[in-house]
């Protein structure tokens, strides 16, 4: 770090005038990674006069640049060419006499402060006046310039003849063109000073060439590619004062292609995943064993992601049986042609022949797209009937087997209910329990981020054998009823699950911790909870919606939480159901959520803190945190739980750097920018999701492994948001195209390799959760932790 400056992982700060800096600060090789620097603050540096072309280029992540009360006289035209993330520039009280708009034209600045510079009145600075007028906000700057007679005049009053904005005019034919054809665009520009003209074609794939004079130009695009559909082409006129552009959107029509069609995968429902390209929107038609498949609410097409002319989705089958096994053909058709692909699907064996997998029900209600032979995106209502066209050729034997299955299932179900009732009576008499303690009915689906998978003998990571989805945890997500709930095996829903009931008078609220969609969370004291302590601090989650469904969800969640017991899962103490609101009681974790904790113990927080500053997390402490989260995830996987929202915001920190998985359902409110809203209700943590979860809503233990990799990245960046520099749509594009997060500066190579092992595109290629935990444990052991971080 240069003398007179100090450097952290993300900031450079130079304010000491002695000795001061004479050149823009540069970092030593092998010190801080310049790509991670987001802020540079320079003050009192009177001998800093120039920013050269290559001074700032290494700081590609730079967002805030402040140079104040210094000697800055000249900024090279291409100084900020590589700094596309720059948002705030403050050059207050320097020695700038002129500043070209060329420095900034490619930047999306939200702030450019130029107060207190001795600008010379000329056409060169007219763009600043134009910019100020365009902003027209109440906090416009008082800018002045010196005229020929060395008089300071307000920039707002500056009048210079032959110095105005240019204009661009694009003469374009109808820009809807068929793939493979060619097109020519013409453009004319005008203005004083005479503008330059250029074409902005973005990332156009098709071959193109332009002929440009000063005021006229043409662009010829040949053999147009379907990849260019939806792209914008602009003709830009630019002079000293500013620029004008005229744009057209290119629409390319082409025949559909089915680029991806795979065997069914199971998660919370069965899904035959596909990707189709085509423009205009192709109509999709499914065939089952050669006959048209009429879609219904049980078998329907869902489009999850649309990228211009590319559609990722599923043929979703709710509760398919052996009768749905067979060949599925997808035909995509528009006026330019059609494509078809076929796959064989096996959902379940014949009754009594093989065990097959349990069917699934989705936990989130997605928008429904497309009936039979409709365009993608058509949301017309469908018949609720199960289609008959696909079963007409079945034999009577199959119908008999269906009746047999129904009868047997009914008898078994009835027996189970009787057994539960008897068990309940037996418990009451055996333990002589008083009060309302009982087995809470489990008659509806829960509403939270941890998901229970019961699939018989399947491994926790198995995605093939239709797992049963029962959601538990602490976050409210819209759900639809799961008729398979009673199919949970003894190993998952313990028959002796008794949710502890806590008397309301034993709970004394102290203060509010936050609020989620479901209700408020409070810090409270709970009396008579533990025999060894008179009272303990707890976190209390209240339920504001007292509807029947919400109450059922509440009871379901309580029962499932009672079964989750591990040192790295937040402890659930019980419920209070006397009157309203309904209350859930959890252990209180003193230091709050892990994301907040990481940020508070990062270099920036340490640098900026006043008074009693926090200490920066060491590498060994980071490893200690990581291995605890991995331990919690090993446990969840062993219990056949898929979390679906693993992130540092959903982990909590207690005394002595103890970390546990669990949140109080406030993440979607407190960390709303971490979620991407799909439709009305669903909020997806896309920055933590693997490609198959984004494209096909497929959540498995392997998708949790991917998220764990992102959590490791969060830990080693002190709580940065993954892909913080990208918008949600850009993130979706990046992840689905196979890009991964870069190695954090503080991250050892072995840990980054572990992250890369979590981010393998193919789920089955990802590291095993137990292996991840073992590796992190070994790394943490090799690097002992000193727990003074918490003071």
């Amino acid at each position: 770090c240069p003398t007179s400056c100090k450097c952290s992982a993300s900031r450079i700060w130079c304010s000491d005038p002695s000795p001061g800096i004479v050149a823009f600060p540069r970092l030593e090789p092998n010190s801080v990674d310049p790509e991670n620097i987001t802020e540079i603050f320079i003050a009192n540096q009177k001998r800093l006069e120039i920013i050269n072309e290559d001074d700032v280029e290494a700081y590609v992540g730079l967002r805030n640049l402040t140079i104040v009360d210094s000697g800055l006289k000249f900024v090279a035209h291409k100084a900020f060419l590589k700094n596309s993330n720059l948002q705030h520039i403050n050059f207050t009280r320097n020695k700038l006499t002129s500043l070209s708009r060329k420095h900034f034209r490619h930047l999306d600045l939200s702030e450019l402060i130029l107060v207190g510079n001795p600008f010379t009145c000329s056409c060169d600075i007219m763009w600043i006046k134009t910019l100020q007028e365009a902003k027209s906000s109440p906090d416009t700057q008082d800018l002045y310039c010196l005229n020929e007679s060395s008089k300071n005049i307000p920039l707002a009053n500056l009048q210079i003849p032959n110095c105005g904005l240019p204009s661009a005019n694009l003469a374009a034919p109808n820009l809807t063109v068929e793939e493979g054809k060619s097109i020519t665009l013409s453009c004319s520009v005008a203005g004083d000073p005479v503008p330059n003209m250029y074409w902005d074609v973005g990332n156009l794939v098709s071959k193109h060439m332009n002929e440009t004079s000063h005021t006229q130009g043409s662009l010829r695009i040949t053999n147009i590619s379907s990849d260019d559909s939806g792209k914008q082409i602009s003709c830009v006129a630019e002079n000293l004062v500013g620029e004008d552009q005229d744009s057209v959107n290119l629409t390319v029509h082409f025949a559909p292609t089915i680029t991806f069609l795979e065997s069914p995968t199971s998660d919370h429902h069965w899904c035959i995943p596909f990707t189709v390209k085509g423009n205009p929107k192709p109509a999709l038609q499914w065939f089952y064993n050669g006959a048209i498949l009429n879609e219904s609410k049980y078998i329907c097409t869902k489009i999850h992601v649309t990228n211009h002319t590319e559609y990722h989705g599923c043929l979703q089958l709710d509760n398919p049986t052996h009768m749905n096994n067979g060949d599925y053909t997808l035909i995509a058709k528009n006026e330019y042609g059609k494509d078809e692909k076929q796959i064989s699907a096996h959902f379940m064996g014949w009754p009594g022949i093989d065990d097959g997998a349990n069917p699934n029900y989705p936990d989130v209600i997605y928008e429904d797209y497309g009936t039979a032979a409709n365009d993608i995106g058509d949301t017309t209502n469908r018949s609720n009937e199960i289609p008959s066209t696909d079963v007409t050729d079945k034999t009577g034997r199959e119908h008999l087997s269906v009746y047999a299955v129904v009868v047997i299932a009914s008898v078994v179900g009835f027996c189970l209910l009787v057994m539960l009732f008897l068990l309940k009576l037996a418990r009451h008499s055996k333990f002589g329990m008083k009060g309302p303690a009982s087995v809470i009915s489990n008659d509806d689906d829960s509403a939270s981020p941890l998901h229970h998978i019961s699939n018989g003998s399947n491994t926790p990571s198995s995605s093939e054998g239709g797992p049963d989805a029962v959601i538990i945890g602490m976050t409210k997500i819209p759900v639809i009823e799961n008729p398979q709930y009673f199919g949970i095996t003894n190993s998952q829903l313990k028959p002796d699950t008794f949710v502890q009931h806590i008397k309301r008078h034993n709970i004394v609220l102290k203060r509010e911790l936050g609020e989620g969609a479901f209700g408020k969370v409070f810090l409270a004291e709970c009396y008579n909870l533990c025999p060894e302590q008179d009272k303990i601090l707890v976190a209390v989650k209240t339920l504001k919606d007292a509807s029947d469904n919400a109450r059922k969800d509440f009871h379901r969640e309580a029962e499932l939480l009672t079964n989750l017991q591990h040192e790295h899962i937040v402890k659930f103490y019980g419920v209070c159901v006397e009157g309203d609101p309904l209350i859930m009681v959890f252990e209180y974790m003193k230091h709050g959520d892990l994301n907040k904790f990481l940020r508070a113990h990062g270099p920036d927080a340490v640098l900026m803190a006043e008074g009693n500053p926090p200490t920066e997390l060491t590498q060994s402490q980071m490893l200690h945190i990581a291995q605890q989260i991995a331990a919690g995830m090993v446990y969840l996987a062993s219990q056949h739980f898929v979390h679906r929202d693993l992130a540092t915001r959903n982990c909590l920190v207690g005394e002595n750097l103890l970390v546990k998985i669990g949140d109080f359902g406030m993440s979607r409110d407190v960390y709303s920018t971490d979620y991407y809203r799909v439709g009305g209700h669903t909020m997806l943590p896309i920055r933590w999701m693997p490609p198959e979860s984004i494209m096909y809503r497929k959540f498995t233990t392997e998708s949790d492994v991917w998220s764990l990799g992102v959590v490791l990245w969060e830990i080693f960046t002190y709580g940065k948001q993954p892909w913080y520099q990208l918008s949600n749509n850009e993130v979706i594009e990046c992840i689905t195209q196979g890009r991964v997060l870069q190695r954090p500066r503080t991250c050892p190579q072995e840990v980054y390799e572990l992250m890369l092992g979590c981010w393998q595109r193919e789920p089955h290629m990802r590291k095993n959760i137990k292996g991840i935990h073992t590796l992190l444990q070994n790394l943490a052991k090799a690097s002992p932790v000193y727990l003074d971080i918490l003071g």
Epitope: S4, W13, S15, D16, R93, V606
Partner: antibody
Framework: QVQLVQSGAEVKKPGESLKISCKGS????????IGWVRQMPGKGLEWMGI????????RYSPSFQGQVTISADKSISTAYLQWSSLKASDTAMYYC?????????WGQGTMVTVSS | LPVLTQPPSASGTPGQRVTISCSGS????????VSWYQQLPGSAPKLLIY???QRPSGVPDRFSGSKSGTSASLAISGLQSEDEADYYC???????????FGTGTQLTVL
């Protein structure tokens, strides 16, 4: 050689004004900050403020803001420290110093005595 | 006003090694470079150490400086009688946008 020469000792009455000087030589006077430091009898050093003679930009310590004025005349390579109304508590030795890598060059000091 | 804290006095016999500490906060010593000054009786201060541990030409190598976190220290080895003086540390303070001096340490050579 590089040096800073300060004006001579002053004896003043409370309420009077005073301007003491510090002349630089042997280096580019406009390119370095000049600071002023107070040392009251038997006490430690106290930083008062700095000026950049190139553009007369100043920084004051909060304790001295509004109590003194620091100025410079670059044409004669001289920095000044002035009071509009002296108090008995202003009695002290005042040093000017050039700021480069630390305060590397010091004036010999000006003793200011304020008494009625 | 935040000042840097030094012990009021220190002493040693000729040839001995003495250390003078200087304690500050994150906004001064913790985030910026420290310089040390020697003031012989009746003289103007003189720069002894700059940028935490650098010696200007002419300063004997018996004088050395170091910094760790929000504290700095000046070490004098092979103490000599002419080292008897007041010693001050100083650093830029970001929150004040100005310099701060230490309280000063009077070194006595016994």
């Amino acid at each position: 050689q590089v040096q800073l020469v300060q004006s001579g000792a002053e004896v003043k009455k409370p309420g009077e004004s005073l301007k003491i000087s510090c002349k630089g030589s042997g280096y580019s006077f406009t390119s370095y900050w000049i600071g002023w430091v107070r040392q009251m009898p038997g006490k430690g050093l106290e930083w008062m403020g700095i000026i950049y003679p190139g553009d007369s930009d100043t920084r004051y310590s909060p304790s001295f803001q509004g109590q003194v004025t620091i100025s410079a005349d670059k044409s004669i390579s001289t920095a000044y420290l002035q009071w509009s109304s002296l108090k008995a508590s202003d009695t002290a030795m005042y040093y000017c110093a050039r700021h480069d890598y630390g305060m590397d060059v010091w004036g010999q000091g000006t003793m200011v005595t304020v008494s009625s | 006003l935040p000042v840097l804290t030094q012990p009021p006095s220190a002493s040693g016999t000729p040839g001995q090694r003495v250390t003078i500490s200087c304690s500050g906060s994150r906004s001064n010593v913790g985030g910026n470079t420290v310089s040390w000054y020697q003031q012989l009786p009746g003289s103007a201060p003189k720069l002894l150490i700059y940028t935490n541990n650098q010696r200007p030409s002419g300063v004997p190598d018996r004088f050395s400086g170091s910094k760790s976190g929000t504290s700095a220290s000046l070490a004098i080895s092979g103490l000599q009688s002419e080292d008897e003086a007041d010693y001050y540390c100083a650093a830029w303070d970001d929150s004040l946008n100005g310099y701060v001096f230490g309280t000063g340490t009077q070194l006595t050579v016994l």
